[in-house]
């Protein structure tokens, strides 16, 4: 990896678990100011593999609300608005980091957690099963 | 919101910024043990809106490596394997949380940051702009 010289102004840590336990400022900096005006907000409806968004809420997690995509159909929508079963709607999944309160119900102590979320759906050609 | 009784075993914090600055254990807990065997790993190639994955690396960020999807075509792939420009390939974007070293180059001090990443692509019907 890349070795970075340590900043002498860093907070000190005598924690024996260092650097496993770190200080995190929860004042979120949002780098998405320059997002594309062509928002993906309506893609879920206009896609050939449309999806619905389901709210997943967990007060012990940060962020507490995550939206999960569920493909509306097993097939894909064609130009006539019919469902083609020679194509399949599948969820696009991504691993994301969240903060889990640990110990539970603690307001200022968390553990990093990786979860898999479905972000949207895409239309794919079916897998070819080669028979021996 | 939901009020949760505070666990008496929580770490103490006299920090004036509390609860803005919290302790986070970086030993990641992976909740994705039960992932679907139908892995989405080959969807980028089989999709009617295929995409390439580009590595985005930043040592000041945790995770330092993020993979960004870029749609291969402006149109979508039709049944003949040709690009159909009556439809559009568009990126599905998601806001994710990352940790940004703050002050820079500090190993144990971070700030939460929201970034927008493209996870994959989907094929959508284009928006028709009616001219008055």
């Amino acid at each position: 990896g890349i070795t970075i010289p340590r900043n002498p102004g860093c907070p000190n840590s005598e924690d024996k678990n260092f650097p496993r336990t770190v200080m995190v400022n929860l004042n979120i900096h949002n780098r998405n100011t320059n997002t594309n005006p062509k928002r993906s907000s309506d893609y879920y409806n206009r896609s050939t593999s449309p999806w619905n968004l389901h709210r997943n809420e967990d007060p012990e997690r940060y962020p507490s609300v995550i939206w999960e995509a569920k493909c509306r159909h097993l097939g894909c929508i064609n130009a006539d608005g019919n469902v083609d079963y020679h194509m399949n709607s599948v969820p696009i999944q991504q691993e994301i980091l969240v903060l889990r309160r640990e110990p539970p119900h603690c307001p200022n102590s968390f553990r990093l957690e990786k979860i898999l979320v479905s972000v949207g759906c895409t239309c794919v050609t079916p897998i070819v099963h080669h028979v021996a | 919101g939901i009020t949760i009784p505070r666990n008496p075993g929580c770490p103490n914090s006299e920090d004036k910024n509390f609860p803005r600055t919290v302790m986070v254990n970086l030993n990641i807990h992976n909740r994705n043990t039960n992932t679907n065997p139908k892995r989405s790993s080959d969807y980028y190639n089989r999709s009617t809106s295929p995409w390439n994955l580009h590595r985005n690396e930043d040592p000041e960020r945790y995770p330092s490596v993020i993979w960004e999807a870029k749609c291969r075509h402006l149109g979508c792939i039709n049944a003949d394997g040709n690009v159909d420009y009556h439809m559009n390939s568009v990126p599905i974007q998601q806001e994710i949380l990352v940790l940004r070293r703050e002050p820079p180059h500090c190993p144990n001090s971070f700030r939460l940051e929201k970034i927008l990443v493209s996870v994959g692509c989907t094929c959508v019907t284009p928006i028709v702009h009616h001219v008055a």
């Epitope: 493909c71 509306r72 019919n82 079963y85 020679h86 399949n88 050609t125 | -």
Partner: antibody, heavy 118, light 113 residues
Framework: QAHLQQSGAELVRPGASVKLSCKAL????????MHWVKQTPVHGLEWIGV????????AYNQKFKGKATLTADKSSSTAYMELSSLTSEDSAVYYC???????????WGQGTTLTVSS | DIVMSQSPSSLAMSVGQKVTMNCKSN????????????LAWYQQKPGQSPKLLVD???TRESGVPDRFIGSGSGTDFSLTISSVQAEDLADYFC?????????FGSGTKLEIK
Amino acid sequence: QAHLQQSGAELVRPGASVKLSCKALGYTFTDYEMHWVKQTPVHGLEWIGVIHPGGGGTAYNQKFKGKATLTADKSSSTAYMELSSLTSEDSAVYYCTRGDHDGRTDYWGQGTTLTVSS
Amino acid sequence: DIVMSQSPSSLAMSVGQKVTMNCKSNQSLLNRSNQKNYLAWYQQKPGQSPKLLVDFASTRESGVPDRFIGSGSGTDFSLTISSVQAEDLADYFCQQHYTTPFTFGSGTKLEIK
């Protein structure tokens, strides 16, 4: 082993509505779609529509749009089809059938006989 | 909508005879990406619901006797019973599941002489 259990025979008056049910047993309800098919001696087998309980999507045969409404209750693993403004033309045997991602409809319910008569 | 035409409408055969019924679609049911034909054959015995016999034009469902043979590709398909048995008395339907609305053939009634 998958099994689809349909509600019993119905005798209803013209102009009324009826809601037929189909309970899914022996498989994960949200992993498959539920198709509905009408059978009459005159028109044979006709596909009415499909619902995906996992994703909430529905698709209908144009012929049955406005006549049939498909819904699903995940908590009871039951699919429903409501038929409205009934006429004698709606008298038929109605089947629910499980569909996979290829559109294969492998398991069929026993059928519900609907008679519309005054 | 895809139109499915089935012939003949009825057949009377003796036990042990070979029987073939046909099904035509007005557009191809072949998916070039996986080389599968999205065509199914169903058997419906009197008073029962349809039972899936063959799918993807030629794949026999588990538990279906091997005397039932599906064949064909694109728009022309057939179901052959190599040696008819008394219990094969039924209506036989073809169905396309390539795209909605799914459509069925009008059926072939098999009678046993």
